[in-house]
Amino acid sequence: GQFRVIGPGHPIRALVGDEAELPCRISPGKNATGMEVGWYRSPFSRVVHLYRNGKDQDAEQAPEYRGRTELLKESIGEGKVALRIQNVRFSDEGGYTCFFRDHSYQEEAAVELKVEDPFYWINPG
C-alpha cells in the first residue's frame, strides 16, 4: 500500500556539541520494521544513516557521520522513527531527506537542521 512521509514541518534546532533528533513518520501509520529507512544529504546524496533488512548499514554511511548517528526505532511499528546525531557540528547544518522504502515504493520528506552556539544571550567574563 501507499503512504506519505512526513517530517517535523519546522527546522530542528541544536546546539553545537549536543545531540539533535530529526523525526520522520509515515502516514497512514503502519509497521515499517521491514522497510528500508534512511537519511541522506545533498549534494551527492551522502548517506547519513541507512537501515535495511532490520539492521543499520554502517558501511554505506558517509565518513563524517560514522559513529555519530543512531536510528531511534522504538515506534517503528507505528511508522515513526527519528535520526539522532551526536556531537553536532556546524557542518551538520542544512537540509536532510528522510525516506521510507517498501519494496519498490519509496517516499521521502525534507528536514532542516539549524546548528547554533550556546552563547547568544550570555556575556563572557
Epitope: 556539541g17 556546524f90 539549524k114 546548528v115 552556539d117
Partner: antibody
Framework: EVQLVESGGGLVQPGGSLRLSCAAS????????VNWVRQTPGKGPEWVGF??????????EYAASVKGRFTISRDDSKNSLYLQMSGLKTEDTAVYYC??????????WGPGVLVTVSS | ELVMTQSPATLSLSPKETATLSCRAS??????LAWYQQKPGQAPRLLIY???TRATGIPARFSGSGYGTDFTLTISSLEPEDFAVYYC????????FGQGTKLEIK
C-alpha cells in the same frame, strides 16, 4: 586541505593599533565559526573572541580582557577573517592564532603570528 | 570564571609506556571538553573533543574519558612523537584552557 594563515603581526607601541588578517582555504569559509586565540610563552592559550557564521548572523563575541578594544570581522567573499586591535597593552603581547570551529572545540589552527607590544 | 586545572605539571615517561593526564574543571562542563597537543614552535592540534571523541586523523592510542568535572587523557604505548605539551580546554561556558602538562622523555 583546510588551511588558515595569519598575517599582520609585528611590533607596536602601547596604546597603538594593529590589524591581523587570516586567509582561509580548502573549505566553505562562510559556513563556519572562526576564533582568535592568543598564547604567551610557557602559558596555556587564551580565547580572544569568535565570529559566527553567516547562518547565525555573523556577529562576534569577545573575552572580557579585550572587549571594547578588539573587533573581529569577516569577509566571506575573500575567505578572510580580521582582528582589529586598538588601545594595545604590553599584556597583549602574544602569538595570535586564527582557528576554525566545527565541533564546538578548536578544530583547525593557523600557524600563528607574533604581536609584540613594547615601547 | 571557569578554571581548568591540569595535573601533573610534568610527566616523565619512556616510549612504550602509558601516560595518564588529568584535568579538573571548577564546575561541571558536561562533556564539553577538548584535549590538544602542542610541540615547540607549533600551534596546538586538536586530539579529542566531546571528552572522548578522537579528532580526524588522531591515532587510536589517544583516548579521552570523563564527564562533569574530572577528565583523563590516556596515551597508550607512547611513541617518540608523543612527547609534547598537552592542554585541556572547556567549551561549556565560553572557553578556558588548563595550564598544560609537559610530557617528557625519561
Amino acid at each position: 586541505e583546510v588551511q588558515l594563515v595569519e598575517s599582520g603581526g609585528g611590533l607596536v607601541q602601547p596604546g597603538g593599533s594593529l590589524r591581523l588578517s587570516c586567509a582561509a582555504s580548502g573549505f566553505t569559509f562562510s559556513d563556519y565559526y572562526v576564533n582568535w586565540v592568543r598564547q604567551t610563552p610557557g602559558k596555556g592559550p587564551e580565547w580572544v573572541g569568535f565570529i559566527r557564521n553567516k547562518a547565525n548572523g555573523g556577529t562576534a563575541e569577545y573575552a572580557a580582557s579585550v572587549k571594547g578594544r578588539f573587533t573581529i570581522s569577516r569577509d566571506d567573499s575573500k575567505n578572510s577573517l580580521y582582528l582589529q586591535m586598538s588601545g594595545l597593552k604590553t599584556e597583549d603581547t602574544a602569538v595570535y592564532y586564527c582557528i576554525l570551529s566545527d565541533t564546538g572545540a578548536f578544530d583547525v589552527w593557523g600557524p600563528g603570528v607574533l604581536v609584540t607590544v613594547s615601547s | 570564571e571557569l578554571v581548568m586545572t591540569q595535573s601533573p605539571a610534568t610527566l616523565s615517561l619512556s616510549p612504550k609506556e602509558t601516560a595518564t593526564l588529568s584535568c579538573r574543571a571548577s564546575q561541571s562542563v558536561r562533556s564539553y571538553l577538548a584535549w590538544y597537543q602542542q610541540k615547540p614552535g607549533q600551534a596546538p592540534r586538536l586530539l579529542i573533543y566531546g571528552a572522548s571523541t578522537r579528532a580526524t586523523g588522531i591515532p587510536a592510542r589517544f583516548s579521552g574519558s570523563g564527564y562533569g568535572t574530572d577528565f583523563t587523557l590516556t596515551i597508550s604505548s607512547l611513541e617518540p612523537e608523543d612527547f609534547a605539551v598537552y592542554y585541556c580546554q572547556q567549551y561549556s561556558s565560553w572557553y578556558t584552557f588548563g595550564q598544560g602538562t609537559k610530557l617528557e622523555i625519561k
